[in-house]
């Protein structure tokens, strides 16, 4: 029985990608009045550009060139975090520190956190039914390609201190294969950036480990300190009291250690 | 505890000014959006408007633009609602309400007061 | 301005019954919507936000679903304090406008 459409080993397009994509569109430009001259029709269009009727294990990073430009964001390059593999506190984090912005932060990051989404070669439908696999299938998918491209140019524009939360639960704290570990540790640029300080965060309450201490980390400070940029790194040892703090740091409680 | 008190209401004849405030205790008032939203006698709730934590941002619905006015002072943990050339169809309870802190308001409203009475009536 | 319309706009049901009330958005809002709670001569009260999350301290018995145009507020086994009338909002664009509300009602 011949296979009229490909099947692909990861999950199709989330439902309702096109109205999902405008209405967050809409809501960013609304709630960040410096994005208010973005057309968010133009951005659906563009985004739509890039991966509709191509082959989704045929993606670049030129595909998304006109996303991109439409896209365009200046953030606070010295307020930049970065994260691995604990998203949920690093977001929890930047809504109450508002001066602070992960990638989901920007209008891009945040059009794309958490959907999913591919086309069909020569066809100008999108595939709700699978969509690649990056390592069953191929790494030039259109999720992963679009990470890349936004990771990539989000290290870029960073400067001074750039902070990244790392997930102290995990085998490897630092992961060389995460997108921090092979994107953003690579386009971080020396002559901008002067430290990158790691927050190690711990999952066990009683866990009093200097996970700084961690062989990974220790590889995160070689690479780091490779490239010319000087590395710091801090525990963060009651994750659930660093974000209560960060809330009211005139709580009495939040001069000792967290 | 987190509370809000609204106070200002009353008796106006149409045309004329109010100012309603909110006063909140029990948190950091300035790091919270915060709302207006009415009840008309009877029927459902209207939004009113927003103000951003810091007062950079500020929407209002269609029905009160060019009319009235959200501000804040974060040194009086106090809201305020400046209403001007008032018509009968503003009669409502006037409620004052909180965003939980997110940072794109998109988490609903978590903290009401109890609401303070406008009356336009000639 | 984004248009909701709740259905039923009133619903008469007993205490156990399992109800669910119906939120329309007139065009697509993701996940951006907001359940809410009110009684006679009250402020309301937030059940749900972000289509399906429990506001901290509300009973498990309301749950939310739905995104894009079509939403759900299901109470699973209705207690005789539930009886009230609900509300939706939506939080896409500014204004957040509401839903004209459902009566739930002892039958």
């Known amino acids: 029985v011949p296979r009229w459409r490909q099947q692909w080993s990861g999950p199709g397009t989330t439902k309702r990608f096109p109205e999902t994509v405008l209405a967050r569109c809409v809501k960013y430009t609304e709630i960040h009045p410096e994005m208010r001259h973005v057309d968010c029709q133009s951005v659906w269009d563009a985004f739509k550009g890039a991966f509709i009727s191509k082959h989704p294990c045929n993606i670049t990073e030129e595909d998304y060139q006109p996303l991109m430009k439409l896209g365009t964001q200046t953030v606070p390059c010295n307020k930049i975090l970065l994260w691995s593999r604990i998203k949920d506190l690093a977001h929890q984090f930047t809504q109450v520190q508002r001066d602070m912005f992960t990638l989901e932060d920007t209008l891009l990051g945040y059009l794309a956190d958490d959907l999913t989404w591919c086309g069909e070669f020569n066809t100008s439908k999108i595939n709700y039914q699978s969509c690649p696999d990056w390592r069953k299938d191929c790494s030039n998918n259109p999720v992963s390609v679009f990470w890349k491209t936004v990771s990539r140019r989000f290290a870029e524009a960073a400067c001074d201190v750039v902070h990244v939360m790392l997930n102290g639960s995990r085998s490897k704290i630092f992961d060389k294969n995460s997108t921090f570990g092979s994107v953003e540790v690579h386009n971080l640029q020396p002559e901008k950036v002067q430290t990158l300080e790691a927050w190690v965060i711990h999952g066990g309450r009683e866990d009093s480990r200097d996970l700084c201490q961690d062989p990974t980390i220790k590889e995160l400070e070689s690479i780091i300190s490779k490239r010319n940029i000087q590395f710091s790194c801090k525990n963060i040892y009651r994750p659930d009291k660093f974000l209560q703090c960060v809330k009211n740091p005139e709580d009495s409680s939040c001069t000792s250690e967290i | 505890q987190v509370q809000l008190v609204e106070s200002g209401g009353g008796v106006v004849q149409p045309g004329r000014s109010l100012r309603l405030s909110c006063a909140a205790s029990?948190?950091?008032?300035?790091?919270?959006?915060m709302y207006w939203v009415r009840q008309a006698p009877g029927k459902g709730l209207e939004w009113v408007a927003v103000?951003?934590?810091?007062?950079?941002?500020?929407y209002y619905a269609d029905s009160v633009k060019g009319r009235f006015t959200i501000s804040r002072d974060n040194s009086k943990n106090t809201l305020y609602l400046q209403m001007n050339s008032l018509r009968a169809e503003d009669t409502a309870v006037y409620h004052c309400?909180?965003?939980?802190?997110?940072?794109?308001?998109?988490?609903?409203?978590?903290?009401w007061g109890q609401g303070t009475t406008v009356t336009v009536s000639s | 301005d984004i248009q909701l319309t709740q259905s039923p706009s009133f619903l008469s049901a007993s205490v156990g019954d399992r109800v669910t009330i119906t939120c329309r958005a007139s065009?697509?809002?993701?996940?951006?919507l907001a359940w809410y709670q009110q009684k006679p001569g009250k402020a309301p009260k937030l059940l749900i936000f972000?289509?399906?999350t429990l506001h901290s301290g509300v009973p498990s018995r309301f749950s939310g679903s739905g995104s894009g145009t079509e939403f759900t507020l299901t109470i699973s086994s209705l207690q005789p304090e539930d009886f009230a009338t609900y509300y939706c909002?939506?939080?896409?664009?500014?204004?957040?406008?509401f839903g004209q509300g459902t009566k739930l009602e002892i039958k």
């Open positions: 103000i951003w934590y810091d007062g950079s941002n500020k």
């Open positions: 972000a289509a399906s």
């Open positions: 065009q697509g809002i993701s996940s951006y």
């Open positions: 909002q939506q939080l896409n664009s500014f204004p957040y406008t």
């Open positions: 029990g948190f950091t008032f300035s790091s919270y959006g």
């Open positions: 309400a909180r965003d939980p802190g997110l940072r794109y308001f998109d988490g609903g409203m978590d903290v």
